[in-house]
Amino acid sequence: KSSNEATNITPKHNMKAFLDELKAENIKKFLYNFTQIPHLAGTEQNFQLAKQIQSQWKEFGLDSVELAHYDVLLSYPNKTHPNYISIINEDGNEIFNTSLFEPPPPGYENVSDIVPPFSAFSPQGMPEGDLVYVNYARTEDFFKLERDMKINCSGKIVIARYGKVFRGNKVKNAQLAGAKGVILYSDPADYFAPGVKSYPDGWNLPGGGVQRGNILNLNGAGDPLTPGYPANEYAYRRGIAEAVGLPSIPVHPIGYYDAQKLLEKMGGSAPPDSSWRGSLKVPYNVGPGFTGNFSTQKVKMHIHSTNEVTRIYNVIGTLRGAVEPDRYVILGGHRDSWVFGGIDPQSGAAVVHEIVRSFGTLKKEGWRPRRTILFASWDAEEFGLLGSTEWAEENSRLLQERGVAYINADSSIEGNYTLRVDCTPLMYSLVHNLTKELKSPDEGFEGKSLYESWTKKSPSPEFSGMPRISKLGSGNDFEVFFQRLGIASGRARYTKNWETNKFSGYPLYHSVYETYELVEKFYDPMFKYHLTVAQVRGGMVFELANSIVLPFDCRDYAVVLRKYADKIYSISMKHPQEMKTYSVSFDSLFSAVKNFTEIASKFSERLQDFDKSNPIVLRMMNDQLMFLERAFIDPLGLPDRPFYRHVIYAPSSHNKYAGESFPGIYDALFDIESKVDPSKAWGEVKRQIYVAAFTVQAAAETLSEVA
C-alpha cells in the first residue's frame, strides 16, 4: 500500500503530492542546462557543474549537500599526439589514416574541449600486423575462430564490432587470444536502425560517429590503484603494473566510414555464417590479413593516451529522516559525460534534479521522510564506476549497517517504447504496485496505467499478465551497492522495442551527437517519458523512505531462487555422465531453496499480523527485510572476483552488462568439457553448489523468528 504516514506531515503530504510536484518542463530545462558543454570526469567543467548542483540542491531545501572528492586513475588522449590507425604499405608509408575526431554537430562547431574518440585506459603502443575480424569479440566468437576455423589471433590486430557485450570483455577476450591490438567499430547493422535518418536529422549514427568508452576489467574494484579502499589523501597506491583491470594491448574505436576502409580489403577465410556479417558493403572476411592485391599492406595503431591520477567530485545531498534517520535510501546517478551527455547521463541527472526539487518543496512545507534519503551525483562513472565505488568504500561500514535501498539514475531513456526495470526480487511488488498507480505516457494507452502499457509491450516470459523485470548486471553505479555490499537495488528507464530494434544500446551512445537536441527533437519532445521515469524512480524512493513497513516481499526472492536453481541444474545436466562419475548433487541447493520458500512464507504471514504500533517490533521486522539482501553476500567473494560478493547475482564473466544467476556455479560449469583436469573442474562445481546452498539456507534463517 502507498503510504502517507511519515511524521510531521499534513495529509496532503503523501506520495501524490510528491508526484504532482514533478514537472516535465523542469526536467527539460535542467537537461538543457546540463548539456551545453562537455563534462568529462576530472575536468574543470565537471567540477564547476558539481558546485552548481551542490548550490541548487541546497536551494531546493536539502539539509546538507557536500562534495566528496577522491584522486583516482583516469585516462586521456595526448592533446599533441593524437591516436589513429593507419594502413601501411610494404615501405612503411601510411596510405590510409582513420579520422582524428568526429565532425561536430550543427550548433556546436565552436565548442572547445570535446575529447576525441578513444578507448579509456588503453596502453600506449604502435603495434602493426595483419588484421583479423572477430565479429563481436564475444567468448563464443573466439571459440568459433580458434576451435572451428583454426584461426590463430596471436600477434594479430583484431577488429571487432561494438555491441552485444561490454567492450571491456571484448578486449579481455582479445588479450587472451594473443592479439596485440584491438580496433572497435560501430557497424550500421547494430547502430543504424532502418528507416531512420542519421543525426542531425534523426537518431541514427553517422559514418563519422564513434563510441567512446572505458575498456577496463575491474570486476567491481573501483579505482584501479586502490582496490577495496577509498582513494583519499593518505591512500597507498599500487604501482601501475599492479593496477587492477588495465588492458595490456592498445585499443582504439572508429566509425563505420573508417571501418569500411579496413574491412573492404580483408582476405583469408570467409565469414563462418550470416551472423558474422554486418551491413557494410564489405565481404566480412575474417582474415588474417588483406586480400591478394593488398596482402603486403599491414595495419598499424598509433596510441598515445596517458593514465593520470586526477581529482573527481561526488555531490552528496542529505534529507534527514524524521523517525529512522539511521536508515538510508539512496538515489544516485552520475554527472560525468564523454561529451555533452544528452542521454548518458544528463537525461538521468535532470530527473534526479527534479526529484530533489520536489522532495525539497515538501520539506519546506514541513514534511520529512520517515527514513533518511541520500542523493548522489557521481563522478567518473564512465571511467569504471569510480565515484560511486570510492564513496561506498569510504562509507562501507555505515552503508552495510544502515543501507535500506539504492535506486540508480543514469540515462532516463534509451528509447521511447516502454518501461525497462532491473531490480532485486525484493522490489518486484513495489514496482508493480507503483506502476499500477501511474499513468502511462504511451500513445494508445491514454487513461491506462503504466503497468498496463508496460505489461502489454514487455510481457514477462514466465508470468502472464505481468511485465518483464530483469536481473541486475553491472556497468552502472548500483554495482558496488548491490554486488559488493548487498544493498537492495533497482533501476528504471524508458527503452526501445527490442523486438524490432536489434541494434545495441542506442545508436548515438557515447558519441559527440548525444546532444540536448537529440532528446528534444527525436526521443522525447514533450519530456513525457522523462517525467514517467522521474515518477517511477522518485516514487520508489518515496515508498522506500516513507512506508512504515519496508515495501520488500521476500516471497518473490523464493520464487526466483527456485527458477535459478532449476536453470543451473539443467545446465549441469547437459553432462549426466560426469555428474554421476563425480557424484555431483544439487540436493543441498534445492533443499535450501525449499527451506527459504517456507520460511519466507511464514515471515510474510507474521508481517501482516504484527503490532505496527510497537516501534521495537516494527524495527526488528524491517531490519530482517533490510538485511535479507545482505545475507546473500559471501565475504570471500566469487572466485578471482573478490568485489563481486553476491551469491545469487553477479555480472556475467562474459558480459559485464548482463546479470548471471548463481554465478559461482555457472562459471564453474562454463566450458567444463574443455577443462584439462575434469576431476578438479567438477570438484569446483561441487564446491560452488555447497557455497550457494549454504548461503541460501543462511539467508532463510535470517527470516526465521528471532527467538
Epitope: 589514416n97 582524428l100 575526431f101 550543427p106 536529422d201
Partner: antibody
Amino acid sequence: EVKLVESGGGLVQPGGSLRLSCAASGFTFSDYYMAWVRQAPGKGLEWVANINYDGSSTYYLDSLKSRFTISRDNAKNSLYLQMNSLRAEDTAVYYCARGGDYWDAMDYWGQGTTVTVSS
Amino acid sequence: DIQMTQSPSSLSASVGDRVTITCRASQDISKYLNWYQQKPGKAPKLLIYYTSSLHSGVPSRFSGSGSGTDYTLTISSLQPEDFATYYCQQGNRLPRTFGGGTKVEIK
C-alpha cells in the same frame, strides 16, 4: 538517371529579388539533402545553403542568411532559392546539388542557371 | 570559417603523367574532404568523397589520401579527358568551403 535542372535565373537590378527553382528527377527526392552552390564569373565555387530531407533544417553562408532563403517541396520534387536585396556581387552561375546527409559530398549537380545583378 | 588552400593553382602536364594536387585546411577536418572536377561551361562532378572513396563511375586512376589538415588528389596516369579544374571541399563543418581550384592544362 539522376537529373537536376535549374531555372529562374536572369538579369535583375540591384535591390531586386529572384526565385531560383531546381527540378529533380531520377531519385527519391525526399531521401536527400539539397544544396545551392554558386560560381562568380572566372572564380571558384562558393557554397550558399543547404536544406535537410523534409525542410525542417536549413543552413546558410552567414553573409547571405538575411537575404536568401532555401526551401523545398518534396511533393513536387523541387528545390528553391529565394534571393532578396540582390547585389552586384551576387552575380554568378547558381548550381543545385544533391547530398546524402548533413556531412556528405554533393554527388550530383545541375547544369546551373545564371543570375546577373546589374543596373 | 575553415579556409581551404589548394596548390598549385595551375599545372601543366602531359598525357600519361602522374599528377598530384594538394589541399590544406586551416584546421583538422577529420577526413571530410571531397574532390570535384569541373570543365569549362559545365557543372562540377564529384570524383572522391571522404578523402579516399571513389564516386561511382569515376576511373580508378583517381585516388585520394590524407588526414587531419593535409589531403591529396592523385591522377596516376593523366588522360586527355582529365584536363580540367579540380576543387577540394570540406564537409566537416559549416559553412562548407571550397579550395580555390587547380587548373590542369596540357603541356
